[in-house]
């Protein structure tokens, strides 16, 4: 094949190889850019900033090499277009630093920085913990900073991400209240803070203020939603990204609901409950306190993380005539009381016998598996007869 | 499969504190599921001494019940038996099991 | 009264039909339930509930109830089937369990 005299060649079937040199000073419209995997960059002394829009359409990429040429600066976000990027070779460069934020969210197996002439800071904090780490082969690369001796080396008690402390109002907070939370950032070199508030939906009313180093939020006119959703103060420097999750509570009376009984392995009488705090429970049978014991007793369901109500059942273990009768879940915290009930009928009576009556044969549903905790039924295979002297 | 071991002292002076505890293994002790104590002395029937659920709801024998305390530690995924002012009519095999219908038990210790 | 009372002692010729039974007043409320415990074992859960038999319990074993008694009957009595046998229900308050004093079939 004839040697190719662009500035750019194919490699196989996806790659592309830049290596004449000084062709290149940016990456637009590179040809067949959205089908590469592969991208080969050598000897392009004028290629020197890396920027988002550089690698847009580049979304199949994998492996990025850009050696031997010119690069001095790598923006936060340039492989934002490039969420698949699994190898980056930056080697023999001029780059002083690279942002955290370059590689975040990226799944690199190797990242390759040797011979650039990197300034020890704590921006490289987080290069330094790669290499601790072991990740993307930092290690053996054995990174030197530029006239300060290996990156391993450089000090870093100081780099430390920022700190935040997020106030929460002491007082109980009602539904309709407004609430003031407040952000307090603390930390060398901040760059950026903010809310993340996409749990609240319509559980509050949201306004924004104040700025760097303290940051302000007014919850106005919540909802008893709002329990169990997280508000979330965050803030950026050049060592990394700091979160804090906060809830608040918001008080607001217990409510009971019952449903029918249904027959499952076992028995179970349906119940919701929901209020802040959460209301504490007892049951009633025909009126009088409800003892439970393993063959009667409330069975909660795996609470939802983000929300107050919680599900479950009064669980009766093959009850019988003595368990029919008025069902009443009491539901109580210190906002209110409330309180259902409901008839439940398991079975006649199974022990009365008059030989006068004719024989009820039934067949108890057969259990299939024990991970009700109940004991795995043996179905009878072999027919049987039922015959009855009357003396 | 739910396995249940029970492990403690074999000897207790009297006027002592018998405590035993039962290991769970092959299923969470959180699970719907209620546990138990049965004991039998030498040569005689058995006798249900107590019960407990995670939520630490329990149940006593009414005949010991003023001695007998029953734990839970979820944790450990282990329950234990606490049998206070022991006397000689307290010798026996103690059993732990799964309630109600104790369909899997521990192999049984002697105390 | 909060007993459970069986018979002391019960035997059967090989092949043929036995039935254990046991009384108590708490039996009008609720199930028994029954154990076989050989000797140095721990026991082993035969029925439960509305006649109901665990996985690897034998058809042979069965339960059936009326009034104050309820019953266990082996249906072709096996050599293994030797053993003690223990009724069980809760209690006539429904707060705590009791046993019967234990039947040896022979």
């Known amino acids: 094949a004839a040697p190719c005299p662009d500035a750019c060649c194919p490699h196989g079937s996806s790659g592309l190889r830049c290596t004449r040199d000084g062709a290149l000073d940016s990456l637009h419209h590179l040809p067949g850019a959205e089908n590469l995997t592969e991208l080969y960059i050598e000897n392009q002394q004028h290629l020197q900033h890396l920027e988002l829009r550089d690698l847009r359409g580049l979304g199949e990429l994998r492996n990025l090499t850009i050696v031997k040429s010119g690069l001095r600066f790598v923006a936060p976000d340039a492989f934002h277009f490039t969420p698949r990027l699994s190898r980056l070779n930056l080697s023999f460069n001029a780059l002083e630093s690279l942002s955290w934020k370059t590689v975040q969210g990226l799944s690199l197996q190797e990242l390759v920085l040797s011979g650039n002439p990197l300034h020890c800071s704590c921006a490289l904090r987080w290069l330094q913990r790669w290499e601790e780490e072991g990740l993307g082969g930092v290690p053996e690369q054995k990174l030197q900073c530029h006239g300060q001796g290996p990156l391993a080396h450089m000090p870093n008690a100081s780099c430390g991400v920022p700190t935040l402390k997020v106030q929460v109002p002491n007082a109980s907070v009602d539904v309709g209240d407004d609430v003031l939370l407040r952000c307090q950032v603390e930390g060398r070199g901040l760059e950026q803070a903010g809310w993340i508030l996409t749990e609240l939906e319509q559980s509050a009313t949201v306004m924004k203020s104040g700025g760097l180093p303290s940051l302000g939020l007014t919850l106005a006119n919540v909802t008893s939603d709002l329990n169990r959703k997280n508000v979330t103060c965050w803030a950026e420097n050049d060592v990394g990204r700091a979160e804090v999750s906060v809830q608040v509570n918001v008080s607001f009376p217990a409510s009971v609901q019952l449903h029918t009984a249904v027959e499952m392995h076992h028995w179970c009488i349906p119940f919701s409950v929901d209020g802040q705090p959460a209301p504490s429970l007892r049951w009633l049978f025909n009126g009088s306190v409800l003892n439970e014991t393993s063959f009667i007793f409330t069975e909660f369901l795996e609470p939802a993380a983000n929300e107050t109500v919680r599900h479950g059942c009064l669980r009766l273990n093959q009850p019988t005539h003595v368990n029919n009768g008025n069902y009443t879940l009491l539901a109580a915290n210190p906002f209110g009381q409330a309180s259902a009930s409901i008839m439940a009928a398991f079975m006649d009576n199974p022990f009365e016998f008059n030989p006068e009556d004719p024989i009820p044969v039934s067949f108890s549903p057969v259990d299939t598996n024990s991970t009700s905790g109940d004991p795995v039924e043996k179905k009878d295979e072999t027919p049987f007869g039922v015959s009855v002297a009357v003396g | 499969e739910v396995q249940l071991q029970e492990s403690g002292p074999g000897l207790v002076k009297p006027s002592g504190t018998l405590s035993l505890t039962c290991a769970v293994s092959?299923?969470?002790?959180?699970?719907?599921?209620?546990w138990t104590w049965v004991r039998q002395p030498p040569g005689k029937g058995l006798e249900w001494i107590g019960e407990i659920y995670h939520r630490g709801n329990r149940n006593y024998n009414p005949s010991l019940k003023s001695r007998v305390t029953i734990s839970v530690d979820k944790s450990k995924n282990q329950f234990s038996l606490k049998l206070s002012s022991v006397t000689a009519a307290d010798t026996a095999v103690y059993y732990c099991?799964?309630?109600?219908?104790?369909?899997?038990w521990g192999q049984g210790t002697l105390v | 009264s909060s007993e459970l009372t069986q018979d002391p002692a019960v035997s059967v010729a090989l092949g043929q039909t036995v039935r254990i039974t046991c009384q108590g007043d708490a039996l009008r409320s609720y199930y028994a339930s029954w154990y076989q415990q050989k000797p140095g074992q721990a026991p082993v859960l035969v029925i439960y509930?509305?006649?109901k038999r665990p996985s690897g319990i034998p058809d042979r074993f069965s339960g059936s109830s009326s009034g104050n008694t309820a019953s266990l009957t082996i249906t072709g009595a096996q050599a293994e089937d030797e053993a003690d046998y223990y009724c069980?229900?809760?209690?006539?308050?429904?707060?705590?369990?009791?046993f019967g004093g234990g039947t040896k079939l022979t």
């Open positions: 509930g509305k006649n």
């Open positions: 092959g299923g969470s002790i959180s699970s719907s599921n209620w």
């Open positions: 099991a799964r309630a109600p219908w104790f369909d899997y």
């Open positions: 069980a229900s809760q209690a006539s308050s429904g707060n705590h369990l009791i």
